[in-house]
Interface confidence: low
């Protein structure tokens, strides 16, 4: 790991990678791009999955937060031998399956998909890819696309959440390294701190949630602050203001001393949540404090 910027957000990250015949001589560049990027997501609550597609979509590594499994997954990724057609929709199908099944206990972890392809998708394949990306989106995913070489940016803007969610790499595969920083900056949604982190029992407070990427939501009106109290009840609050690096939120009134509220953020009105290790605790405050 080479230091530099990192992401502390706790969410599910899916890499959907083109392994069709046209990337045969460029797989190393794709692998190193993923490997470098993967190492920059360092939250213990972040899970990762590697999916490859050609004429079929294959989940090379199912969602896991286990760093040893991720290391092994990267080794498997390095061994991939590209070949076949560009059935990108197959990759999104594999992601949607996991998004649904990994989160069926009721609490949904936020999902971020980074899909990489070279080349244009022809008629039906574009239609299917857009359809499957929409299905992933409907399950709460944020979709980014990386287009290398002969891609069609208009197509990718429709597969991704918007044209701002497309990363064009016009200078060929060797230029992939150059976009790692901008992908990290855009795809990272992280909660770093809460101020105050200790509040008075029984009193109403406002909390400033410090972090990054809060304005990456498709609609900032759908951003929510969420407080998971004593690992059981979850209360969602609409923020007073949403900025890229902070949220101003009403804190729930916690009546008893020693209560703990784990801070989470939803970018989609509670459909799914970014988790964090930031905790707000209650203390006894005398009248003079």
């Amino acid at each position: 790991e080479d230091g530099g910027p990192a992401c502390y957000g706790g969410f599910d990250l899916y890499f959907i990678l083109d392994k069709s015949g046209s990337v045969l001589h460029h797989w190393n560049e794709i692998y190193y791009f993923v490997e470098q990027l993967a190492h920059k997501f360092i939250s213990p609550q972040l899970r990762m999955s590697f999916i490859v597609f050609s004429t079929r979509g294959t989940t090379l590594m199912k969602l896991t937060e286990d760093r040893e499994q991720i290391r092994q997954g990267l080794e498997e990724l390095q061994k991939v031998l590209p070949g076949g057609d560009t059935y990108m929709h197959e990759g999104f199908e594999r992601a949607s399956e996991q998004i649904y099944y990994e989160n069926r206990q009721g609490y949904r972890t936020a999902s971020v998909i980074i899909a990489l392809t070279d080349g244009e998708l022809h008629e039906d394949l574009f239609f299917y890819s857009e359809r499957e990306a929409n299905r992933s989106r409907d399950l709460g995913a944020i979709v980014y696309c990386v287009g290398v070489k002969d891609f069609n940016e208009t197509q990718l803007a429709r597969i991704a959440d918007s044209k701002d969610h497309v990363f064009p790499v016009n200078d060929g595969f060797q230029a992939l390294q150059g976009i790692i920083h901008s992908i990290l900056k855009k795809s990272c949604i992280e909660i770093l701190a809460a101020e105050p982190s200790t509040i008075c029992a029984g009193e109403s407070f406002q909390v400033v949630v410090r972090g990054n990427g809060f304005r990456h939501a498709r609609n900032v009106d759908r951003v929510l602050c969420s407080f998971k109290i004593n690992d059981s009840v979850t209360l969602n609050e609409k923020p007073f203001s949403v900025e890229d690096t902070y949220l101003l939120c009403p804190a729930p009134i916690l009546k008893e001393v020693g209560m703990k509220a784990a801070l989470q953020v939803s970018m989609n009105d509670g459909l799914s949540f970014i988790s964090s290790s930031v905790i707000i605790t209650t203390t006894h405050c005398s009248d003079g404090s």
Partner: antibody, heavy 118, light 107 residues
Framework: EVQLQESGPGLVKPSETLSLTCTVT????????WNWVRQAPGQRLEWMGY???????YTNPSLKSRITINRDTSKNQFSLQLNSVTPEDTAVYYC????????????WGQGTTVTVSS | EIVMTQSPATLSVSPGERATLSCRAS??????LHWYQQKPGQAPRLLIY???QSISGIPARFSGSGSGTDFTLTISSLEPEDFAVYYC?????????FGGGTKVEIK
């Protein structure tokens, strides 16, 4: 022409395991998605789960951990096991295919009736 | 899970008349909606996929429309062989779910 044929016992005792096999002709189970769908008397159709071309299985959460779907590519068959059955599992059981770029069941077996009774 | 609601439960129509069947999803499923016909003692048969796409071999009198949460299957002029139960299916989200069915019977 693709054809699917279900087979298995028509009567199963409560608490036992229901086992059915679907034999596929005209297509390889190493392509597409191979599903089990059931229909209890007078009830709507219920999707139970599938095994994919790669051998991955996904099942309906309502069946919890009672369901297992396996395949035998050498025989071009896939199978259903449903544990701890009750009379509510009495139904017509269908195997069905859906193709990889779709989510609709385009080919069905004719169905086999399974009664759960002591 | 997504709940599919069909109405009416029974539709009494004379041969040659038009039949309109409705299906409603409990949440937005875009156009991931499929229609099936089932006759007594037979397996369901796919009629329409992705809300409005026709299947080769299915008569042109069957058509579908709608997107989001509200969908319609129309049989423009009922033939004797069309009297059956019709089901809609959510093909958007797992677990795939079916409506309760509409029985089209002879008036």
């Amino acid at each position: 022409e693709v054809q699917l044929q279900e087979s298995g016992p028509g009567l199963v005792k409560p608490s036992e395991t229901l086992s059915l096999t679907c034999t596929v002709t005209g297509d390889s189970i190493s392509s597409d998605y191979w599903n089990w769908v059931r229909q209890a008397p007078g009830q709507r159709l219920e999707w139970m789960g599938y095994i994919s071309y790669s051998g991955n299985t996904y099942t309906n959460p309502s069946l919890k951990s009672r369901i297992t779907i396996n395949r035998d590519t050498s025989k071009n068959q896939f199978s259903l096991q449903l544990n701890s059955v009750t009379p509510e599992d009495t139904a017509v059981y269908y195997c069905a295919r859906y193709k990889t770029i779709t989510s609709m069941f385009d080919v069905w077996g004719q169905g086999t009736t399974v009664t759960v009774s002591s | 899970e997504i709940v599919m609601t069909q109405s009416p439960a029974t539709l009494s129509v004379s041969p040659g008349e038009r039949a309109t069947l409705s299906c409603r999803a409990s949440q937005n499923i875009r156009d991931f909606l499929h229609w099936y016909q089932q006759k007594p003692g037979q397996a369901p048969r796919l009629l329409i996929y992705y809300a409005s796409q026709s299947i080769s071999g299915i008569p042109a009198r069957f058509s579908g429309s709608g997107s989001g949460t509200d969908f319609t299957l129309t049989i423009s002029s009922l033939e004797p062989e069309d009297f059956a139960v019709y089901y809609c299916q959510n093909g958007h989200s797992f677990p795939y779910t079916f409506g309760g069915g509409t029985k089209v019977e002879i008036k």
